[in-house]
Every structure is written in C-alpha cells, then in structure tokens.
C-alpha cells in the first residue's frame, strides 16, 4: 500500500530484568525527513483527542528537548532510514508493546514492536540432529533469542557437567531480521556417550551462571562386547580345555544375533555367549573374538590370542644360497613350528654336531670345500626337543684342487721317445671338463687329461697342465728331464791363436753345447785312427806329418756324437827340394831338357831361384827351367831354391849331362 510507511525490525524482542535490549530497525517515510519521534510503552489511540496515550519512554522534538528517561532509552536512528533503539537496563515492566510514533512534515505513523522481558534469564535451546550414530560427526546447536551490545553473554557446553574439549563456534545476530546468540559444537560421539547429559549453559561476561538447557544423548551404536577366557592368559597345552565368554556391555538398539570368529572366519554352530573348546590341538591356536549384531551393525570384541603350546615340529633347513662358491658367504636357517618359539638349536653337518652353533641361523662368512654336505637341525623349547628333519644339501663349487702333471713314461726319457703325461687332481666341483697345457705344441691329446708328445725334443724342458671346470687350476711345471746324446760337437783350436807353424805347440779342444746326462767321454780320431780320450788333443811340436783331417767324438750313456772333420794345416818352409830332369839327366844336344824344382811346402812355394854349378843364379824364376835346344855347354850341376811365406829351402845339386849328337860326332 503506497500510503504506508515501510518498517523492518524483529517482530518480538526478548530480554530479562537488568539486561538490555537492542532493537535493530529501519524505515522509509512517505515524504521528507523525520521531524518528530516518540517511543511509547503500550500506546492506546484516543479517538477523542485523535492522539496516542501511554508512557512516553523517549521523545525527540524540533527544539531538541530530551526527557530524563532518555538516559535509559536511546534512539540510535536518524531522520530518514534508521530507527534503531536501545534500552539499558531493561526492566520487567518494560514488557509489552513499544510504539514508535513517527511524524514527518505531512505524514504520521505508529509502528509497534513487541518486547518480552522475563524476571530471570530464560534458558537457551539445544537442537540435536534426528539421529546420532557413534563415530559420526554431528553438530550440536545451542540457540538463545537474545543479543545486546551492552550486555555480553557466553554459551558453554558441558558433558555430564564437565566442559567439553571440542571448540565451539559462537555467532550473534543483531539484524532487522533476527536477534539471537548461537553456539555450534562439532562432536563425534562414541558409544560411551549414550545416555549422557549435554548442557548448554548461559553465562554472563564473568562466567556467572544465568540459565541452561540440557538434553540426554541417544547414541545409536553396535553392541559393545567384553570377552573373558579361562585360563586368563589364553596359553594352554595340547589336550587342555578353554572356555570363552562374551558379555554385552552396551547395545543401542538391543542386539539380535551372536557368533564367534577365529582368525576372522566365522565358527559354525557357535551362536551362544559361551564358546567351549575341549581337548585343544595346535591348529586351534589363533585369534578369537565374538560378534554380536543389532540394527546399527555387528560389534566385535577384542581378540583373544589363544596359544596352544607344543614341542617343536620336525625342522627343515633353508640354505642361502646353494650351490655356493668357495670363499662366498652362506646362511643356514633352521625352521621349526613351535610354541613357544624355540630357545635353542642343535646343528648337524653330515650327522655330526656343529659345536658352538646353537642359534636359529648359522652364518659362514667364507665357505670352504669341506663345508659341502647335508645340514640338519633340531629345535628345542620348554616343552621338549623336536626331531631332526630331512636336512638340506649344500653344494660347494671350487676350482680343481692339488693339480699335478704326472709323467707316465719310465724314466729316464730319451730324445726321440714318445712321452705320455697325465693331468691329475685331487678334487673338483663341478667336474673337470677340459685341460690346458703349457707350453703349447702340436701335440696330441688321445684322451681327456692325457698329453702325448711324439719324438720328444731334447729341449722340451718343462710342461704344466691346468685342470678346468668353471675355473682353471694350474699345476706346478714338471721337468721332463729329457736325456740326449751330446749336442753341437765341434773341434776348436785353443793354441796357437794364429796359424800353425811346424814346431809350434798345438792344442785342440773338443767342444759340445750340452749333454744329458752330463757325464761324457771323448775320443780323437785321425783317418780312422784313435789318437786320445781327453777333451783336448795336444802336440808339443807339430810337424807337417800331423796335418790332416781330425774328428772328435763325445759320448754319454745315451749315445755318441761326432764333430765335423776338422782339417789341421801345418805351415812350413819349403823342404825336400830336389831338381828332377826330363826326359832324364842325360840329354843329347839339340833336344829339349826340362828341370823341375820339386818341393814340399805349406803354403806352396811362391818364388823359385835357379843356380848353376858356379852358384850363379840363373834368370829363371818359375818352378820349371826349360833348356831348348840344349847345348853341350849346358852340362853341369844345377840346384834350386824355393821360397814361401814361412821361409826358404834349397835342393841338393843335380847334374845334367848333354852329349853330342851323332851328327856332331860325324862332323868331327
């Protein structure tokens, strides 16, 4: 209706004696600004006077006069929009209707607001969700239809009279729509909160109690159970009896079904609150609980760990790792089911007790070949000693051990023999698959680990073999000790250092490079004739007759070896010179006569000189002196002289007779 003033404010405001009231209010006048404002308490319209009668709590006029009551009642508004009011303190008799008489230049309006002032602080109101379930977060709300700037209050939450730990969020509203104070508490109720009293307490600024509201929590929860066991420690031996009882300590709503579980699995035909286990076996060890259901769901008791104790079962051995390489580490683990756990272990290797090893694990930091074999163990607990299980096999792999090269031939070995060697070893794991030989040669291997050397050389000194599996192990080299006849026999002249001259002292040495065996004998030979049996052949004074072809022989038990023939050359001055005549020493004149100077010399004569019977040297220097034609006066004694690098020699006189020819005689 366009003829109405427009007001907005809470319809009713609530307060209590001594508190205050804050009235949020807005308005819009029909025309112009507010010129007059009167606050009435329970106004009544007087038709006669056409005015409102009632107690005037506040009045503002054009001249600005303020009644004494205005100290308690304040108009906090303005001339066009705001009509907010405050009454501080508020009294019980302020209850009723407040009338706001507004006048502008041309228009008037009476706006009514209800004020409800109680004698004592009224209680807040707790609001709960329709259903509360355990562990589900809910918000509890405490609402009080009061708020005033001049009168601070607080709302506190209590559970069974004890302040709640959770932080509450308090909010206030002083708006034209609503005036209230609200506290919200987020809370996760547990089953134990069921039936408990929650209080929202109104307090003044000093924490003084003003009023409260209480509610009883109805927390829906699964059944809460307690399990009891006889014996109480739930430790029994095989054959004993065990009783478990399930007690419901709380359920909301009431429970409907009961069951028992072992290790999470339901036990069949067990639907009462008591579980009787008679003559238990070790298989009945485990975690037991009872389960009771209601409409919310199933509830489970705490688990009871039933331990059925028994002596260790036959043990097994686990090896990390087999096969093992020599020098690597290996761990053995003794596994045996037992309750209580074994406290002592006895270990066996190939049936023999391993002294000083009494733990579940045996750690060998460096495996040796002898560690191979079967390992077994026995576990022991307070109830007894278990049995030894089948055991586990440790395979230790290692290179061939104690490899030796063995000569199969009868000794000694002679040069040219066929030698057979074998490669032997003490042990190996895995098996030997191949062999190697040093030095390499074009030798035959007739079978695995056997070497055949045909026509063994004198210089085949040592041979080594290796036996190989995944690794090769070398034997120490073995000496073949090949025996052979003396080698490289030769004649060596020791003295003189230069050429041999007749008369010199001469020594010849019979040398050889090697011989096995070392014991040798020497033989000197010239033209098939034995000369001596020493390593040296000595001539005190050599003569040309000693020249010739010499050989030395060296022999040992294997055989004998001759040197190459060595020529002994003796140098000497020409000797045994003689003049020979051809055709004879009597020649007819006119014929030809040849004189030859014959000699024995080494080196041969290099220069000849001829002499006549007068020792007159003739002008001829060759070995032959040719007279042609020969004359009678050529008759006479001739001699020659031969010269070589060593010296000179002369012949005796030889007489040439030249006789007359028949013609000459005939002429005479």
């Amino acid at each position: 209706d366009s003829s109405k003033w427009v007001f907005e404010h809470p319809e009713t405001l609530y307060a209590w004696e001594g508190a205050c009231v804050w009235i949020p209010c807005t308005y819009r006048a029909l025309d112009g600004d507010l010129e007059s404002f009167i606050l009435f308490h329970n106004p009544e319209y007087n038709k006669n006077t056409s005015k409102f009668d009632g107690t005037r709590l506040y009045e503002s006029t054009k001249d600005g006069k303020v009644p004494s009551e205005q100290k308690r009642v304040q108009f906090l508004g303005d001339k066009n929009k705001n009509c907010t009011l405050s009454i501080h303190p508020v009294h019980l008799n302020d209850s009723g209707q407040l009338g706001l008489r507004m006048e502008s230049k041309t228009e008037k309006w009476m706006e009514r607001i209800h004020l409800n002032v109680s004698e004592r602080p009224f209680p807040p109101h707790i609001q709960l969700p329709p259903e509360i379930q355990e562990s589900q977060e809910v918000t509890l709300t405490c609402l009080l239809n009061f708020s005033c700037y001049g009168y601070p209050i607080q709302l506190q939450w209590l559970l069974e009279g004890v302040p709640m730990r959770q932080a509450a969020v308090t909010s206030t509203s002083l708006t034209i729509k609503s005036v209230f104070t609200r506290s919200e508490l987020k809370f996760s109720p547990q089953w134990s909160h069921h039936g408990k009293i929650v209080t929202c307490q109104l307090q003044d600024a000093d924490g003084k109690f003003l009023s409260n509201d209480t509610v009883q929590l109805n927390v829906k929860h699964t059944p809460k159970l307690e399990i009891k066991v006889t014996p109480s420690d739930a430790i029994v031996r095989e054959g004993d009896s065990v009783t478990m009882t399930c007690e419901v300590s709380s359920s909301n709503p009431e429970y409907t079904t009961v069951s028992w579980l072992k290790d999470g699995t339901s036990l069949k035909k067990q639907n009462t609150f008591t579980l009787n286990l008679r003559e238990v076996t070790k298989d009945q060890s485990g975690k037991y609980c009872c389960q009771v259901s209601n409409d919310v769901g199933p509830g489970r008791s705490e688990e009871v760990f039933l331990q059925v104790q028994y002596a260790p079962e036959p043990s097994t051995v686990q090896i990390l790792h087999s096969p093992a390489v020599e020098g690597s580490q290996v761990e053995f683990l003794c596994m045996s089911l037992a309750n209580p756990l074994p406290t002592n272990y006895t270990w066996y290797h190939n049936g023999k007790e391993m002294q000083g090893r009494t733990e579940e694990k045996v750690h060998i930091p460096k495996i040796l070949p002898w560690h191979a074999g079967t390992y077994s163990c026995v576990a022991e607990n307070i109830l007894g000693t278990g049995q030894r299980g089948p055991g586990a096999e440790l395979d230790v792999q290692y290179p061939p051990k104690k490899v030796t090269t063995v000569i199969q031939n009868p000794m000694p070995i002679r040069e040219g023999d066929t030698v057979t060697l074998s490669c032997n070893y003490n042990s190996s794991n895995p098996s030997v698959t191949r062999y190697e030989w040093k030095p390499h040669g074009a030798w035959e291997e007739p079978s695995l680990g056997v070497l055949k050397i045909q026509n063994v050389g004198w210089d085949n000194t040592t041979i080594a073999c290796a036996a190989c599996n995944s690794w090769c192990s070398w034997a120490s080299p073995v000496a073949l000790n090949v025996q052979y006849a003396p080698r490289d026999v030769r004649v060596r002249k020791i003295k003189p250092l230069s050429e041999i001259h007749s008369g010199n002292s001469v020594s010849l040495q019979c040398d050889f490079s090697s011989s096995h065996p070392k014991e040798v004998q020497f033989f000197w030979e010239k033209n098939g004739r034995l000369l001596g049996k020493e390593s040296q052949l000595n001539f005190d004074s050599i003569s040309p007759e000693d020249a010739g072809s010499y050989s030395c022989w060296v022999n040992n038990s294997i055989g004998q070896t001759a040197s190459k023939a060595w020529t002994l050359e003796v140098l000497y001055a020409p000797r045994r010179l003689r003049v020979s005549m051809s055709p004879g020493d009597q020649v007819m004149e006119g014929k030809s006569a040849t004189l030859t100077c014959e000699s024995d010399a080494n080196p041969p004569v290099s220069h000849y000189t001829w002499f006549d019977w007068n020792n007159q040297s003739l002008p001829y220097h060759s070995q032959k002196l040719r007279l042609e034609p020969v004359k009678v006066q050529h008759s006479g004694a001739y001699w020659c002289q031969g010269t070589n690098s060593v010296g000179k020699g002369r012949s005796p006189l030889s007489t040439l007779t030249v006789y007359y020819s028949p013609e000459t005689i005939g002429r005479r």
Epitope: Q355, G356, R357, T358, K361, V362, H363, K366
Partner: antibody
C-alpha cells in the same frame, strides 16, 4: 701337535717400529680355515685384540690401531708378521699370537703362544 | 664396536663354593661369545665358545649360558686351580673385543 711361538725385540725406543714374528709349527698357514691373530696385554690390564690374517690373506684390524698396524704372512716360512709403527710407552705389553678357529664360521682363539714382553722406553 | 662389560671386577669365593661371572654386550648379537681363563704369567686358555660349548679338555664344572646381550660363566664348585682372571670375548663382529676381566680370588 700345533704350536705357536712369538719372537721380537724385548726393548723398543719410542717412535720406532716394532716387528713381531709368530712362527707356526705342525700345520701350514696355507691350510683352508687357518687364521692367526695378535692380542696384547699391558701389565695388570685386560686383553686387547690387534689384528688377524686368514688363509685367503684377508686382513682385519683393531679400529683404534688400524693406522699403525700391518699384518702379513710368509707361507714358505710358516710365519705371520705384525708391524706396529710409532711405538709409545703405553704400548708396553705382552704380545700374544693365537690361532683363531674357523669351523662353521669364526670361532674362538683355541691355541695361544706363550707371549713376548715388549717394553717401550728411551 | 661391541663393548663387553664384565662384572664383578673381583669375586671372592671360598674353595668348593660356586661362582657366577657376568658379561654384558653393548649390542645384541649372536651367541658368538667365548670365555678364557688366565693365570699369572701364563697365556689365556679357552674354556667356552659359542656361549655354552666347552672347549676340549675343560671340566664339566665350567658352564656357559646366555643369549642376546647377557652372558654368564658359572663355576659350580671352585677348585684351587680355578682361582684366576676370566675374560669374555665376542667374535660376532669386527673388531673382536674382550671384556675387562673378572678376578676370582680365594676368600
């Protein structure tokens, strides 16, 4: 019968190097599982382990003396040698060599030498 | 390193009585523990290895026990030749370590 015998100088000057020899008889050092160790004992005090050498020539040393110790063996002479550098009077002690058992892992010191007393003094 | 602590340092016992010697390891290991006996002027002698195994030729009155960190050597009835210093030693970890010793003397 296996025996061990220690030998070395009875007197060493400070800062000098001590060389001790342990001669083993009755069993070769090269035998698999054979390990020789050195232990010392200052007068009136407890035993202190120094070093060990095994058949594989693996060596182990005391943490506190590691930088001063060297252990080695001469298989041909069947001897184990321990050298200790930078000797000090606090190193005065009886030095023992012993065999460390090795069966299914390391064992205790089952055989001891008679010990050799070493005095460090200037 | 593993520290071995022996207690008591000295134990006074009458001949024929029993004696209990304790050895504590600073860290839990295996039972790789040995006990040695040492008489004045002599080298130590192995009594027990593997915490409880008697060495060759050791009389049955010597008993070793224990595991983890606590080990015990018990001499059931002391003979005159048993009065000596006793050492425990661990050989589970490098470096090997000895205890400080317990002197068993005649009361």
């Amino acid at each position: 019968q296996v025996t061990l015998r220690e030998s070395g100088p009875a007197l060493v000057k400070p800062t000098q190097t001590l060389t001790l020899t342990c001669t083993l008889s009755g069993l070769p050092l090269s035998t698999s599982g054979m390990a020789v160790t050195w232990i010392r004992q200052p007068p009136g005090k407890a035993l202190e382990w120094l070093a060990l050498i095994d058949w594989d020539d693996d060596k182990y040393y005391s943490t506190s003396l590691k930088t001063r110790l060297t252990i080695s063996k001469d298989t041909s002479k069947n001897q184990v040698v321990l050298t200790m550098t930078n000797m000090d009077p606090v190193d005065t002690a009886t030095y023992y060599c012993a065999r460390m058992g090795y069966s299914y892992g390391w064992d205790a010191f089952d055989l001891w030498g008679q010990g050799t007393m070493v005095t460090v003094s200037s | 390193e593993v520290v071995m602590t022996q207690s008591p340092a000295t134990l006074s016992v009458s001949p024929g009585e029993g004696a209990t010697l304790s050895c504590r390891a600073s860290q839990s290991g295996s039972r790789n523990i040995a006990w040695y006996q040492q008489k004045p002027g002599q080298a130590p002698r192995l009594l027990i290895f593997g915490a409880s195994a008697r060495a060759t030729g050791i009389p049955a009155r010597f008993t070793g026990s224990g595991s983890g960190t606590e080990f015990t050597l018990t001499i059931s009835s002391l003979q005159s030749e048993d009065f000596a210093v006793y050492y425990c030693q661990q050989y589970n970890n490098w470096p090997l370590t000895f205890g400080g010793g317990t002197k068993v003397e005649i009361k």
